[in-house]
């Protein structure tokens, strides 16, 4: 069927396939130090690693892409590792009247898949 | 602000950045010839091309990823070109009782962005 179960064991070896990884970043790294006050350091979960054939396929399109990449690697790129969901983050930032809290729904990855 | 407008002009030259491209594929290419009857040939829109800094950023996470890739290219991958939306496709396929039509919502890309 079009919706085969995504393969979940990495054929390339531990830590090589698409997964969530934590990256430390300061407000300076992000270029946000002029408007975000806190936290000064963010633990940003990001999606890294390769997407071998049918590994964690996001959907039917990703399965097709994986197959066609095998047939036409110069024309069709392999699927790549991107967020499947996000974790909301609250930041303290400057406003005209002082400091306020704001949530960001799309800042930190919570899960990854191959799209 | 975190949500800068995604940059839409490609700094790498025409056709090099993330865009939608049509790929012809037969049912044999897809490995579907045993269960899909029609259409025999599919025009599959796929997302291809590079994602230079802030080009068509999907969201805040993608903007952060682009920035951190510039600072730590070995640790943080560049954003990559993936579907932002899909076009439904109707396939005619075999069933135990004969033939039926089924809609697939996630088969053909409609738009692309850098995630």
């Amino acid at each position: 069927s079009a919706h085969a179960h995504p393969r979940d064991s990495c054929p390339l070896g531990p830590g090589r396939c698409c997964h969530l990884e934590t990256v430390q970043a300061t407000l300076e790294d992000l270029g946000w130090s002029d408007w975000v006050l806190s936290p000064r350091q963010l633990q940003l979960s990001m999606c890294v690693g390769e997407c071998p054939h049918l590994y964690r396929s996001a959907n039917t399109h990703a399965q097709i892409k994986a197959r066609l990449h095998g047939l036409q690697p110069d024309k069709v790129p392999a699927p790549c590792c991107v967020p499947s969901s996000y974790t909301p983050v609250v930041l303290m930032h400057r406003t005209d009247s002082g400091v306020s809290l704001q949530t960001y729904d799309d800042l930190v990855a919570r899960g990854c898949h191959c799209a | 602000s975190a949500h800068a407008h995604p940059r839409d002009s490609c700094p790498l030259g025409p056709g090099r950045c993330c865009h939608l491209e049509t790929v012809q594929a037969t049912l044999e290419d897809l490995g579907w010839s045993d269960w899909v009857l029609s259409p025999r040939q599919l025009q599959l829109s796929m997302c291809v091309g590079e994602c230079p800094h802030l080009y068509r950023s999907a969201n805040t996470h993608a903007q952060i990823k682009a920035r951190l890739h510039g600072l730590q290219p070995d640790k943080v991958p560049a954003p990559c070109c993936v579907p932002s939306s899909y076009t439904p496709v109707v396939l005619m396929h075999r069933t135990d009782s004969g033939v039926s039509l089924q809609t697939y919502d996630d088969l053909v890309a409609r738009g692309c962005h850098c995630a």
Epitope: R40, T87, P88 | -
Partner: antibody, heavy 119, light 110 residues
Framework: EVQLVQSGAEVKKPGESLKISCKGS????????IGWVRQMPGKGLEWMGV????????IYSPSFQGQVTISADKSISTAYLQWSSLKASDTAMYYC????????????WGQGTLVTVSS | QSVLTQPPSVSGAPGQRVTISCSGS????????VNWYQQLPGTAPKLLIY???NRPSGVPDRFSGSKSGTSASLAITGLQAEDEADYYC??????????FGGGTKLTVLG
């Protein structure tokens, strides 16, 4: 082990001032925000405000703005909640709580400080 | 009046399954995660479920959380006498930041 230890119960008269404390241990105090939560007798939980102990940035719930002051002394890993002029309606249990990693929930709580204001 | 609405009380017999609902709006639960706290009599609240459906270490798997649209719920299976407590949902609201439900008193019968 992460711990938030609050100062003891207080009995005060209306109009008096008060400062209660919350000392953090077992973690990097400046890496996590501290919030204060009020629970009036027999009632539910109300968020009062939050402080970033590193930069001492504070944000208050609209209901508590101007009524209390939140502060912190990072050299002794302690956050404070203070009143300049107490009212009988300030009688409640006050909890300090540490914010989880992304600031959306409270992962550790102090044991609470009961403040009684009565003439 | 709480921004998040919970039933004032629920009850169940030992071994039973009970659920506690938490109803909000598109400005709170609809856009952010829901967290649940347990407050045993005479003690401080304790984090029970965070980010809709995650349990901190040490919380039994009898407790589970879910969210759908602008509502969330806490389910407790295999009810035990020591589960008798007040339960609070908490989220974020764009107008008043961190908000709690009014609390639900769980009574274990018998």
């Amino acid at each position: 082990e992460v711990q938030l230890v609050q100062s003891g119960a207080e009995v005060k008269k209306p109009g008096e001032s008060l400062k209660i404390s919350c000392k953090g241990s077992g973690y990097s105090f400046t890496s996590y925000w501290i919030g204060w939560v009020r629970q009036m007798p027999g009632k539910g939980l109300e968020w009062m405000g939050v402080i970033d102990p590193d930069g001492s940035y504070t944000i208050y719930s609209p209901s508590f703005q101007g009524q209390v002051t939140i502060s912190a002394d990072k050299s002794i890993s302690t956050a404070y909640l203070q009143w300049s002029s107490l009212k009988a309606s300030d009688t409640a249990m006050y909890y300090c709580a540490r914010y989880g990693r992304y600031g959306t929930y409270f992962d550790y709580w102090g044991q609470g400080t009961l403040v009684t204001v009565s003439s | 009046q709480s921004v998040l609405t919970q039933p004032p009380s629920v009850s169940g017999a030992p071994g039973q399954r009970v659920t506690i609902s938490c109803s909000g709006s598109s400005s709170n639960i609809g856009v952010l995660y829901v967290n649940w706290y347990q407050q045993l009599p005479g003690t401080a609240p304790k984090l029970l479920i965070y980010s809709n459906d995650n349990r901190p270490s040490g919380v039994p798997d009898r407790f589970s959380g879910s969210k759908s649209g602008t509502s969330a719920s806490l389910a407790i299976t295999g009810l035990q006498a020591e589960d008798e407590a007040d339960y609070y949902c908490q989220s974020w609201d764009s107008s008043s930041n961190y908000v709690f439900g009014g609390g639900t008193k769980l009574t274990v019968l018998g």
